[in-house]
């Protein structure tokens, strides 16, 4: 009996540019002789329904149809036909199929590969065109994929040390697509510093599929109102 097992759950998630290993384990009733077996990996993109051959291994020959694609002959001996793809790109997401032939038997398995990119986050202070005692804080998230992202603002005061979500005076702009397929977005918080307690800590909280824990950037309101020179107006605040 010949059986193939892919990643549990049927989906593998990998970071952009990573050297990903797409799992495929072979279960066979006898020891594997790699000189008399065949492995073929196929890929079907998310946008087109056409299946493309990525890699093939037959006895004494292997061929990569995608540069750098490889199945380890040394791992194959112990039943591991996993495919290594170095420098994975966003457009390589989709369905991967591992087909194993031990003549006359054939087995296959499929897995969905999701490629994600983590956002980079930075805080900026923008005072251009703002009224006296008014500040605009911008939280820029860039280089993320997929597009879905959640940006919230929180504050902690000495009176209320637990974070409180801010819902007023928050504007989150549209997501912008970059040339490389990743996305950027900016969320703005308008503050009237005269109405806020000095020592209050504000946080921009970014949640995204690529992040295990939210990305947090913070600043503390000081007694003296921020007065930044022109060149500092788009500097990193935190």
């Amino acid at each position: 009996d010949l059986k193939v097992e892919m990643m549990a759950g049927g989906t593998q998630i990998t970071p952009l540019n990573d050297n990903v290993t797409i799992f495929c384990n072979i279960f066979y009733s006898q020891p594997l002789n790699i000189t008399s077996m065949g492995i073929t990996w196929f890929w079907k993109s998310l946008t087109f329904d056409k299946e493309v051959k990525v890699f093939e291994f037959f006895g004494d020959h292997q061929e990569a149809f995608r540069p750098g694609a490889i199945v380890s002959p040394w791992r194959l001996k112990s039943g591991d036909a996993s495919l290594r793809l170095p420098g994975i790109q966003l457009e390589e997401a989709g369905e991967y199929r591992c087909e194993v032939v031990v003549t006359p038997l054939k087995a296959q398995g499929t897995v969905q590969l999701e490629v994600v990119a983590s956002p980079a986050s930075r805080l900026l202070l923008d005072q251009v065109g703002m009224k006296e005692n008014e500040d605009k804080y911008m939280c820029e998230s860039s280089g993320f994929y997929p597009e879905a992202i959640n940006i919230t603002w929180e504050k902690q005061t000495q009176k209320f040390p637990h974070p409180i979500e801010i819902s007023e005076d928050v504007i989150t702009g549209p997501t912008i697509k970059n040339m490389d397929g990743t996305f950027n977005v900016t969320s703005c918080l308008k503050l009237n510093s005269s109405q806020e307690d000095p020592g209050t800590v504000y946080q921009c909280v970014v949640r995204h599929a690529s992040l295990h824990t939210p990305l947090r950037s913070n600043f503390t309101l000081t007694a003296a109102r921020h007065s930044l020179s022109e060149t500092e107006k788009t500097d990193n605040f935190s």
Partner: antibody, heavy 120, light 111 residues
């Protein structure tokens, strides 16, 4: 920095078993196999076998089959080599070594070695 | 099993002079256009360290005075100018077939 840190020296009686550990750090544990090699006093190197941490698959030198068991604990990036029914000629330094398996096959980082002495 | 025979078994070299070690395999260690022959150096009291893999590729951090060549059954490790720190035992190893086997070792000492 890639590091393989092995457990300390062992003294065993003939017929007993020994279990040597190899704690890996500084790389993705499942991306490489773990080889085990031994060296008897004043002798050359002898390959015992290897294990694929990805699926726990093992390959053994026939000479040791039935006496050696290679295992891994992925959660703590540690590989183990257990040798049973020890004989005096099993006295050796036992090494674990990280083994590249995709772009060639070679042991690029080695543990410091564990001395196993079998004596009655 | 593939048997690897190294020659010479020992050599004594003056610093600055070249050195060469041969490794002959009982059968070809080539597969799909690549040669699965590696070279290691074991310095006294230390574990082995990788010098050369795939017959001729220098491992990162290894000085370029070391070089490897050969294919099929005949392989050579060369040191262009021997230095005092090169003393130890040199082993060839094939990784084409299991069990992976080592040569018996060549001991290099400084004159």
């Amino acid at each position: 920095e890639v590091q393989l840190v092995q457990s300390g020296a062992e003294v065993k009686k003939p017929g007993a078993s020994v279990k040597v550990s190899c704690k890996a750090s500084g790389y993705t544990f499942t991306d490489y196999n773990m080889d085990w090699v031994r060296q008897a006093p004043g002798k050359g190197l002898e390959w015992i076998g290897d294990i694929n941490p990805n699926n726990g698959g093992t390959l053994y030198n026939q000479k040791f089959r039935g006496r050696v068991t290679l295992t891994v604990d992925k959660s703590i990036s540690t590989a183990y080599m257990e040798l049973s029914r020890l004989r005096s000629d099993d006295t050796a330094v036992y090494y674990c070594a990280r083994s590249e398996v995709f772009y060639g096959n070679y042991a690029d980082y080695w543990g410091q070695g564990t001395t196993v002495t079998v004596s009655s | 099993d593939i048997v690897l025979t190294q020659t010479p078994l020992s050599l004594s070299v003056t610093p600055g002079q070249p050195a060469s070690i041969s490794c002959k395999a009982s059968q070809s260690v080539d597969y799909d256009g690549d040669s699965y022959m590696n070279w290691y150096l074991q310095k006294p009291g230390q574990p082995p360290q990788l010098l050369i893999y795939a017959a001729s590729t220098l491992h990162s951090g290894i000085p370029d005075r070391f070089s490897g060549s050969g294919s099929g059954t005949d392989f050579t490790l060369k040191i262009s100018r021997v230095e005092a720190e090169d003393v130890g035992v040199y082993y060839c190893q094939q990784s084409k077939e299991d069990p992976r086997t080592f040569g018996q070792g060549t001991k290099l000492e400084i004159k």
